[in-house]
Each structure stands twice: as C-alpha cells, then as structure tokens.
C-alpha cells in the first residue's frame, strides 16, 4: 500500500541531538512497558535515501539471506522480492532455504497505481540489529510487481507493522510483529525515530546516511527529549488516532473536528507527506500561504509538484508557520499537541538545481482517505507504538531538524471536550475496508 504519494519516502543524515535536552519527567516511567533505558544494539539500525524509504536489515531463511526491508506502519504484510527485478540487487531465493514452507496460497495487492503479487509461505526471520531472536513468520514472496520497487532505493521488501485486520489476503494471515511477540518474550511495543536530513543530500552523503532507529520491545530514552505523551489507538487496524484540533502558527483552523479524521487518521511511516482530507488541506494551505505572504510561490509548489530553491543556507524558515496537531489524550477531556516546523514539512530534494542552491518540495498534500501522519510528522518525533496498552506515544526527537529560533514540540495537557465526537464512523459495507494506494 505504498504508491501514489505513499512512497517514495525520505530519510537522511541523523545529526547530533540538537537543541536543549529537557529534564526527563519520571511520572510516566513506571508505565512504560518493555525494557527501559538503552537499546544500544538497535540504535541507528535504519537507513534510507532521500525520499525513498526507511529500511532495516533483516535475514530470512536457512542459511540466512540478508535483505533490506522498508519499515511501514501503514500495512501489515511482510513481503519481499522473490524473483529477479531490474530495481533489485538481490532477492529472497526460497529454493535455497531449508526452512521455507509453502502455504500454497497466493496474494494479490493492487494499488491506485501499480501492484504486487506473490506466493505465501513461512520461514525463519531475524533482525541482525534488533532483538537476538529468530521467529517463524509469514512471508509474501513477491513474484510480480508494478511500480512497487524503487530504482536505487536499496530496499527489497516491506515490513508491515500494522494489525492483522488489514493484512492481505485476509486477517487470518498473522503479521510479523504478532508472530514475534507470540514466539518470544519480547514486549508488545516498538518505537521509531526517523531522522530526516533537513537539507539536500548529494549521492555520496545519501548513501552513507544514518536514517534513524527502530527499537523493538521498548523505549530508548536517548532518542527523545522531554516527556512522552500518549494518544489512544482508536481501532487496531491501521494505527488509527484522533485529531481534535489543528493550528497554523497558533491560529485554529476552526473546523468541525470530524473533518480532521475523515475518514480516519493514521500514523504511517510508509508515507512521505503529512496528508490531509481535502477540506482540511485547503484550509491549511490557505493559512500557510497567508502566514508566508511576504513571498509568493506558484500553485504547483503548494500542490507538491514544483520545487522552490534558495541560495544555499538562505532558506527563509522564519516566514513559514509551524503546524500543530492536537491529539486525544489518555485522560477524559484532555489533549496534547505536537508541533512541526517547516524544516519537517518542506522536504529537501537533491540534484535538481545547482550545488549553490537548497531546493524543497512542499510535503503537505491532499488525501481522499483521511489524515496520514507520514514521515513529515514522524521525523519531528520519537514515536512509540505501544500495542500492549493500545496507545501511541510522541516525544520530541533528539534528531529532529530545527533552527535557533524554533523547535518541534510535544506539549500538554489541554482541556478539550467531546473528543469522542471527532472520530469518524466508517459506514459498514460488504467490501474490504482496506483502501490501498491512498492517492
């Protein structure tokens, strides 16, 4: 489910932790499941090139075959290239694995543009820079695809970390993380720190870049500053959450909060942009344009198509507003807000102008399938997917890109009434609820 604007993604160099480290609040420490403190073996285990996805190294089969796998919280299949493809340097060779078991079942996943299809099986899987365990997991061996793999992206498969409800061909196919938790003593929690580059990377830098961390089984306190704030997972399919208010530079968009979650709001590491429902997008862009009106940009820029360039080092970050999303809190009538900077929502693009320029794409876009909090949001924060307690945590990422005047923020509590009314109830039909290829 990664086409349209879902992928390619962006990652890049993880700079040193920037800005002041806030004193850690300890009132929630006891509530955090899993191992606490350091997961040093998992830190910096993600890589990625600008706009092309965050991936983790995994091994499948016996003897182990090493593959780079895209980390995607917006889908639920573990699927890997299993046949030659022009864009793949390597692929899973089932015939070389003594532990491969064929499930004698096919899987077909169409997108708005493109598709992948393959054959289901199980095999032994491990994550070299992850927990020291090997699990038997379902694998979709991709035998045919169209517009799925990305030339030069360096990943050969996708790790869907969402819930079984949206697995293909149906919810009986156990997702990888469920298998991992079931077969080991690893707590039912993982966390992601995606580190955006914040500046255009040349090819040498991009290839050598550190993309971030996927911590399996807990929370690493070195990856964030301040405290973690949690929002309930509304329903276990996608990682669905509820947005209760949106502000641009502190100005409320003043829309019925149902609009923000029409038809859902999800946290998706497999999407590049912050994607907003049509009405919300239009209101947000109008507000962002007004806030940055000392300079005008072509319509194509606001559509995410044209690039705008400034002489290297002169990007006028100060003219662009911050974007704040208020999320339902864990306590009744309480919310918290996450605030991102233009350094997150203006996505650096390399190799288009000259080395004397910094060029960017506007990475907020329109959606017909609800709000998608993609890399644009996640690169500002350390995001905890606390499946055990059915909640998602946000804290300011230690690697987020900012300047001397503003920083990304996670702040609360705020009093917000009737937040339950903000959720949209999708009418039940006989058709599958999975909307692939969110255009």
């Amino acid at each position: 489910t990664h086409l349209g604007i879902r992928l390619p993604l962006r990652s890049g160099l993880a700079g040193p932790p920037l800005g002041l480290r806030l004193p850690r609040e300890t009132d929630e420490e006891s509530e955090e499941p899993g191992r606490r403190g350091s997961f040093v073996e998992m830190v910096d285990n993600l890589r990625g090139k600008s706009g092309q996805g965050y991936y983790v190294e995994m091994t499948v089969g016996s003897p182990p075959q090493t593959l780079n796998i895209l980390v995607d919280t917006g889908s639920s299949n573990f699927a890997v290239g299993a046949a030659p493809h022009p864009f793949l340097h390597r692929y899973y060779q089932r015939q070389l694995s003594s532990t491969y078991r064929d499930l004698r079942k096919g899987v077909y996943v169409p997108y708005t543009q493109g598709k992948w299809e393959g054959e289901l099986g199980t095999d032994l899987v491990s994550i070299p820079h992850g927990p020291n365990v090997t699990v038997r997991a379902n694998i979709a061996a991709i035998t045919e695809s169209d517009k799925f793999f990305i030339n030069g992206s360096n990943w050969e498969g996708i790790l869907g970390l969402a819930y079984a409800e949206i697995a293909r061909p149906d919810d009986s196919l156990e997702p990888f993380f469920d298998s991992l938790v079931k077969q080991t003593h690893i707590p039912n929690i993982f966390s992601l720190q995606l580190c955006g580059a914040g500046f255009p990377l040349n090819q040498t830098e991009a290839l050598a870049s550190v993309g971030g961390s996927m911590i399996i089984g807990g929370i690493d306190h070195s990856l964030y500053t301040g405290r973690l704030w949690y929002t309930p997972i509304r329903r276990e399919w996608y990682y669905e959450v509820i947005i209760v208010r949106v502000e641009i530079n502190g100005q409320d968009l003043k829309m019925d909060c149902k609009e923000y979650n029409y038809d859902k709001s999800i946290v998706d590491s497999g999407t590049t942009n912050l994607r907003l429902p049509k009405k919300v997008f239009e209101a947000a862009v109008k507000s962002i344009k007004a806030a940055s009106s000392t300079e005008k940009f072509p319509d194509g820029f606001w559509l995410g198509e044209q690039l705008v360039c400034w002489q290297a080092g002169t990007t006028p970050w100060n003219i662009f507003p911050v974007i704040s999303l208020y999320l339902m809190g864990e306590v009744t009538n309480q919310s918290f807000r996450i605030t991102i900077l233009p350094q997150q929502y203006l996505r650096p693009v390399e190799d288009v102008a000259t080395s004397q320029d910094d060029c960017y794409k506007f990475a907020v876009s329109q959606s017909s399938t609800g709000t998608v909090m993609g890399a644009v949001i996640m690169e500002g924060f350390y995001v905890v997917f606390d499946r055990a307690r059915k909640r998602i945590g946000f804290a300011v990422s230690a690697c987020h890109v900012h300047d001397e005047f503003r920083t990304a923020a996670v702040e609360g509590p705020f009093v917000t009434a009737d937040m339950e009314d903000c959720g949209y109830n999708i009418p039940q039909t006989d058709e599958s609820t999975l909307m692939t290829g969110r255009a």
Epitope: T294, E295, K296, F297, E305, Q306, V308, V352, C359
Partner: antibody, heavy 120, light 108 residues
Framework: QLQLQESGPGLVKPSETLSLTCTVS??????????WGWIRQPPGKGLEWIGN???????YYNPSLKSRVTISVDTSKNQFSLKLSSVTAADTAVYYC????????????WGRGTLVTVSS | EIVLTQSPATLSLSPGERATLSCRAS??????LAWFQQKPGQAPRLLIY???NRATGIPARFSGSGSGTDFTLTISSLEPEDFAVYYC??????????FGGGTKVEIK
C-alpha cells in the same frame, strides 16, 4: 495595457556598476499576482535569467551572479531596478525586464530590452 | 542542474510546411515548460506555457506537447512571420531559471 520599459546607460566601464531601471506603466507593480524579473542576452547568444523581485522586496537571484547582483523595487515610482557590480566585457548584453505571470511561473510580458556595452 | 537541450539547432523550411521543434530536459520537469519566440531585434514572446497551453493571442497553428523530459513545439503550417528563434524554459525548479539553447527556424 501594461507595458515595461528599461532605461539606463548604454555604456559602462569595466569594474564599474551597471544600473538599469524598469518602469511599469498601465498597471501596478504592487499587484500580488506577479513577480518582476531581469533576463539578459549576450549578442548572438541565448537567454540568461538574472533574478526576480516581488513588490514586498523579496528577491531571488541566479546563483552564478548572486554575489554581484542587487534587484530593488520602488512601489511609489512603479519601478524596479537592477545593479550589477564589477562588470566585465562578458556582461555585455541586451538586458530585458519582464513580468513573471501565470501563477508566478512564466515571463508573459517583456520590455523591449536595452543594450549595455561594457568597454573602456 | 536541469539542462534543456533543443534540437535541431537550425531548421530550414518553407512557408506552409510543418515545423517540429524538440526540447529535452536532463531530468523530469513534469509539465512545467514554456516556449518563447524571438524575432531579430525584438524581445522574446511567450507562446506556450505548462507544456501545452497557448498564451493569450497566440495563433492555433502553434501547439505544444510532452511531459517529463521530452517536449515538442509544433507549428502546423509556417507563416512568413514564424521564422524566428524559439526557446524552451523549465519552471519545475522555481524561480524559473533555465532556458534551452534555442532553435532557429529559417527560410529554406
């Protein structure tokens, strides 16, 4: 009908500063719908973009000329100006001012151009 | 840097003939491309914007096509006043900065 007219000296000595002004008539330079720009064309050669300005004073310059170029706007006179310092013979060209319309994307209206020769 | 390459450098044709001019970008510029006409001693004039839209007052014999990296300006039947130099320009990277080297359409 909106028109653009370049003015300024036709001869500039090497190492001096080239100064040109573009007067906008038949419309307001303060329109929020346009940027205003300078383009040049050396004799017998192609077009080279120099830079743009918005009525608010926001500027964009060609990186290859950035260190020598200043574009400014005077909304009270309905004019915008170009200054190019430390000129050499390579700066000899016809200099055009133009309006960047069609959603700030395309140079849809041009002045007639003025030839500036750099010579001692 | 995006480079625009125009071909041919010179096109020798007779009035009434069809002219086909090419502009190739070194990487995709989507549909953000314009065509200009320049006659000797005159300023350039915008003919086509967004790859295929005719600018105000431009005759229907001028048409533009293409997207991505390959673009074409077609003059369906050359009139005497069409003999000029034609330039393409990309605005995918903004502000617009890159012009092609030009194609001269001359009388055969």
């Amino acid at each position: 009908q909106l028109q653009l007219q370049e003015s300024g000296p036709g001869l500039v000595k090497p190492s001096e500063t080239l100064s040109l002004t573009c007067t906008v008539s038949g419309g307001s330079i303060s329109s929020s719908s346009y940027y205003w720009g300078w383009i040049r064309q050396p004799p017998g050669k192609g077009l080279e973009w120099i830079g743009n300005i918005y009525y608010s004073g926001s500027t964009y310059y060609n990186p290859s000329l950035k260190s020598r170029v200043t574009i400014s706007v005077d909304t009270s006179k309905n004019q915008f100006s170009l200054k190019l310092s430390s000129v050499t013979a390579a700066d000899t060209a016809v200099y055009y001012c133009a309006r960047l319309g069609h959603g700030y994307n395309y140079f849809d209206l041009w002045g007639r151009g003025t030839l500036v020769t750099v010579s001692s | 840097e995006i480079v625009l390459t125009q071909s041919p450098a010179t096109l020798s044709l007779s009035p009434g003939e069809r002219a086909t001019l090419s502009c190739r970008a070194s990487q995709s510029v989507s549909s953000y491309l314009a065509w200009f006409q320049q006659k000797p001693g005159q300023a350039p004039r915008l003919l086509i914007y967004d790859a295929s839209n005719r600018a105000t007052g431009i005759p229907a014999r001028f048409s533009g096509s293409g997207s991505g990296t390959d673009f074409t300006l077609t003059i369906s039947s050359l009139e005497p006043e069409d003999f000029a130099v034609y330039y393409c320009q990309q605005v995918y990277v903004w502000p617009p900065r890159t012009f092609g080297g030009g194609t001269k359409v001359e009388i055969k």
